[in-house]
Interface confidence: medium
Amino acid sequence: EEELQVIQPDKSVLVAAGETATLRCTATSLIPVGPIQWFRGAGPGRELIYNQKEGHFPRVTTVSDLTKRNNMDFSIRIGNITPADAGTYYCVKFRKGSPDDVEFKSGAGTELSVRAKPSAPVVSGPAARATPQHTVSFTCESHGFSPRDITLKWFKNGNELSDFQTNVDPVGESVSYSIHSTAKVVLTREDVHSQVICEVAHVTLQGDPLRGTANLSETIRVPPTLEVTQQPVRAENQVNVTCQVRKFYPQRLQLTWLENGNVSRTETASTVTENKDGTYNWMSWLLVNVSAHRDDVKLTCQVEHDGQPAVSKSHDLKVSAHPKEQGSNTAAENTGSNERNIY
């Protein structure tokens, strides 16, 4: 009689994560008597997957009834497959022995490959805010996919970006892979409402890419522009000076009025108006009693925006130009003497 052969007809099996893998194995003879065992890998470090004789293998079921005397089908099913299950599985026939069974013959092996979907891409931006015209980096990460082949694209407001670098790890064979990409984006003043999108396409997704997004409102800081103007005299000896704080983002802003370098009032921006581009405007005014001053008054509007160094704009109020009579035509100068370049 011909010697027993262990036949594993499938060289490879491809299974999606979460599915059940069927690993086929048949023997050509009932002799010699002895159990079948399944292993992942070969050699001394191989991992026992199923033992017909003993043990508890909750994820493994046999395709046919191994207790039947004439059974020669030793195929198994492994449930709830994960990428960690990938590898080469061997069906091994043992000969009954004493005290231990002896390995008799092994099948050629079946390589189990696991198709796993990538995780939803996570996009993260810089830790600190940046101002327009600066280049900032965004990273995108997705994990746990297999096979290794994957495509990643970056978009800003629907326009594809080209300045990015992508790595898929590990470089060699692995049960699953991760992708990491870094894109560079140049900020503009209009980017408060902008969005950066990372799109990942993988064979398991069938044309429906996964997307991760980041809002540039979390990244951008648009510094304010300041304008100090003198309003018509409200009452005798009183001048209303306003400080227009325009086009800033985020809203966090503190304004201090200085009269000849001395703090007059400090306030926090509260009732701001929002512009179409997402930036804010705010106005503060100061009522100056001209009669309380003998000399000209230097009024300074000093703004601290989002924890940045203060920017300021000054206005010289000529006291001599304010006679006690009606002073609606008073001369006023906006010297901008303490103006700072805030870009």
Partner: antibody, heavy 117, light 108 residues
């Protein structure tokens, strides 16, 4: 080996219905999308849309909405393409093509449809 | 939709000649999603070049692809009779996916 085998040529009259099949073998059918492409006689290729073989959700190009339908029989690893109320301009060869990261890596041999009164 | 224009529509080349086919897009196409297909009369198209510059299995090394944005090309370094066919560029960067009108390449 991977194969996409399409049904044979069809001769139909205007107003009739035709259903073309595309049987896949050599790979797990539900792992790859299936796309349909039209090629009118002597003309170029026109992508018509695709069907997600996992969810059976079809996507049609605007020009192929209404009279056209993609469907599946996943247990038989087969995709179908149906045209209702046939018109003369439907005369063409229709191809199924496997999707995935290598879009169009395998194509059916094509099914020639002739619509004539 | 993105319209792909191939030029020239028809061309003939002598054996050994260098041939360049171009594909121009009306808006930017991701290089990862720009493919070329070869089709011979009576046959289905064959994937020839994927992701702008990668040769599909079995494609001779005399073929190459390049390009980015709205301009792509397929080059044959030295034409052979077996290369006589129609070549179509294809984008699946954005819906609806589209093909170019094709270039019919003949042998002189």
């Amino acid at each position: 080996q991977i194969q996409l085998v399409q049904s044979g040529p069809e001769l139909k009259k205007p107003g009739e219905t035709v259903k073309i099949s595309c049987k896949a073998s050599g790979y797990t059918f539900t792992h790859y999308s299936m796309h349909w492409v039209k090629q009118a006689p002597g003309k170029g290729l026109k992508w018509m849309g695709w069907i997600n073989t996992e969810t059976a959700e079809p996507t049609y190009v605007d020009d192929f909405k209404g009279r056209f339908a993609f469907s599946l029989e996943a247990s038989a690893s087969t995709a179908f393409f149906q045209i209702n109320n046939l018109k003369n301009e439907d005369t063409a060869t229709y191809f199924c093509a496997r999707g995935g990261l290598r879009q169009g890596d395998y194509w059916g041999q094509g099914t020639t449809l002739t619509v004539s009164s | 939709q993105i319209v792909l224009t191939q030029s020239p529509p028809i061309m003939s080349a002598s054996p050994g000649e260098k041939v360049t086919l171009t594909c121009s897009a009306t808006s930017s196409v991701s290089a990862s999603y720009l493919y070329w297909f070869q089709q011979k009369p009576g046959s289905s198209p064959k994937l020839w070049i994927y992701s702008t510059s990668n040769l599909a299995s079995g494609v001779p090394a005399r073929f190459s692809g390049s390009g980015s944005g709205t301009s792509y090309s397929l080059t044959i370094s030295n034409m052979e009779p077996a290369d006589a066919a129609s070549y179509f560029c294809h984008q699946w960067s954005s819906y609806p996916y589209t093909f170019g009108g094709g270039t019919k390449l003949e042998i002189k």
